[in-house]
Amino acid sequence: SPSPVPPSTALKELIEELVNITQNQKAPLCNGSMVWSINLTAGVYCAALESLINVSGCSAIEKTQRMLNGFCPHKVSAGQFSSLRVRDTKIEVAQFVKDLLVHLKKLFREGQFN
C-alpha cells in the first residue's frame, strides 16, 4: 500500500487548494452560501469540515471537503456541529475559506502540521 503523505505535505496541498479557489475571485463562492463561523484556535480541521459539509452541490469546494476529511480523525456528517462553532454567526463561504487559509498558513509557518 502507498506510504502515507507527510502531514506537512498534506497541509501544504490543502493551502494550495484554498488558494486555487480564492485567487482573484470576486463572484460569491457556492452561490453565496452561508456557513457557520468557527473558532480557529483548536480542532480547526474537523470544525471546518463540520461547517463546510453542509454546503452541497458546490464543485468549487468539493476537493477542499475531501482534503479536510483526511485531516479529521472522526466521521463528520451534515448537520453535525461541535462546540467550536461561533454561536449564531454565519459568514459567506468565500470569507470562511479566506479566514481558514490565513489560519492554516500561520500553522504551517509555526510547524504545526497536525
Epitope: I15, E16, L18, V19, I21, T22, Q25, K26, A27, K105
Partner: antibody, heavy 126, light 109 residues
Framework: EVQLVESGGGLVKPGGSLRLSCAAS????????MSWVRQAPGKGLEWVGR??????????NYAAPVKGRFTISRDDSKNTLYLQMNSLKTEDTAVYYC?????????????????WGQGTTVTVSS | SYELTQPPSVSVSPGQTARITCSGD??????AYWYQQKSGQAPVLVIY???KRPSGIPERFSGSSSGTMATLTISGAQVEDEADYYC???????????FGGGTKLTVLG
C-alpha cells in the same frame, strides 16, 4: 524602501538563451507572488508568467507564447526572481519587467502588481 | 486565449471626465486592475480589485465594474494624467494574467 531591480538583459541571436534576474528588497520576498511582464517596442504590456510563494505551492503559470520556452524560478534565500529564456525568437524583443503580485498577502486574493522594477531590455536579432 | 478589450484612445479637455472601458468575459467573476504608464516609465497601479485606490493615488481616479465591463474614471482630468492606461485581470481559472491592449489618454491642453 520596496524595490525590484532587474538585470541580465542584452543582445542575443534567435534560438539563443538568456537568464534575467530580479533582486528584491524592502519586503518579505518569500511571501510574495512574483510576475514577469514584457513590453515590445511601441507596444502594450504583455503578461509573461508568474510564480506563487512557496507556501502557496510555488507553482508557475505562463502565457501561451512563452510556455515551454521560458521558466520562472525563485531563490527566497537570495530574495531573487529569475526568468530563464530559451529558444528565443525575434518577437521576444522587449523590455522585461518583474513585478510583485500580492506583496505580503496571506491569502489567495490577487492584489495587483503594485511594485515594479525599472525593466531590462532584451533584443533578439541576428 | 483570454482577451481584454480597451479602446485605443480617449481624448478629453482639462477638467473633463475621462472614462476608459475594458471588456472581458471573465470580469463578472474576476477583479480588474488598472495601471498608468507614462512614456519611458514603469507602470503604476492606480486601481485594484475593480474600485479600490492604492495610497498615494489621487481621488480623481476611480474604478467600477458591471457585468463584463470594467471602467476607469478620471474625474477632472489633468494634463499630468496624459498616459497609457492598461486594464489587467485573469482568466476564469485565476491562473493566467492578461492585459488589455492599452488606451492612450490625451488631455488636450
Amino acid at each position: 524602501e520596496v524595490q525590484l531591480v532587474e538585470s541580465g538583459g542584452g543582445l542575443v541571436k534567435p534560438g539563443g538563451s538568456l537568464r534575467l534576474s530580479c533582486a528584491a528588497s524592502g519586503f518579505t520576498f518569500s511571501n510574495a507572488w512574483m510576475s514577469w511582464v514584457r513590453q515590445a517596442p511601441g507596444k502594450g504590456l504583455e503578461w509573461v508568467g508568474r510564480i506563487r510563494s512557496e507556501i502557496d505551492g510555488g507553482t508557475t503559470n505562463y502565457a501561451a507564447p512563452v510556455k515551454g520556452r521560458f521558466t520562472i524560478s525563485r531563490d527566497d534565500s537570495k530574495n531573487t526572481l529569475y526568468l530563464q529564456m530559451n529558444s528565443l525568437k525575434t518577437e521576444d524583443t522587449a523590455v522585461y519587467y518583474c513585478a510583485t503580485d500580492q506583496v505580503g498577502a496571506y491569502y489567495g486574493d490577487y492584489y495587483g502588481m503594485d511594485v515594479w522594477g525599472q525593466g531590462t531590455t532584451v533584443t533578439v536579432s541576428s | 486565449s483570454y482577451e481584454l478589450t480597451q479602446p485605443p484612445s480617449v481624448s478629453v479637455s482639462p477638467g473633463q471626465t475621462a472614462r476608459i472601458t475594458c471588456s472581458g468575459d471573465a470580469l463578472p467573476e474576476k477583479y480588474a486592475y488598472w495601471y498608468q504608464q507614462k512614456s519611458g516609465q514603469a507602470p503604476v497601479l492606480v486601481i485594484y480589485e475593480d474600485s479600490k485606490r492604492p495610497s498615494g493615488i489621487p481621488e480623481r481616479f476611480s474604478g467600477s465594474s458591471s457585468g463584463t465591463m470594467a471602467t476607469l474614471t478620471i474625474s477632472g482630468a489633468q494634463v499630468e494624467d496624459e498616459a497609457d492606461y492598461y486594464c489587467h485581470s485573469t482568466d476564469s481559472s485565476g491562473n493566467h494574467g492578461v492585459f488589455g491592449g492599452g488606451t492612450k489618454l490625451t488631455v488636450l491642453g
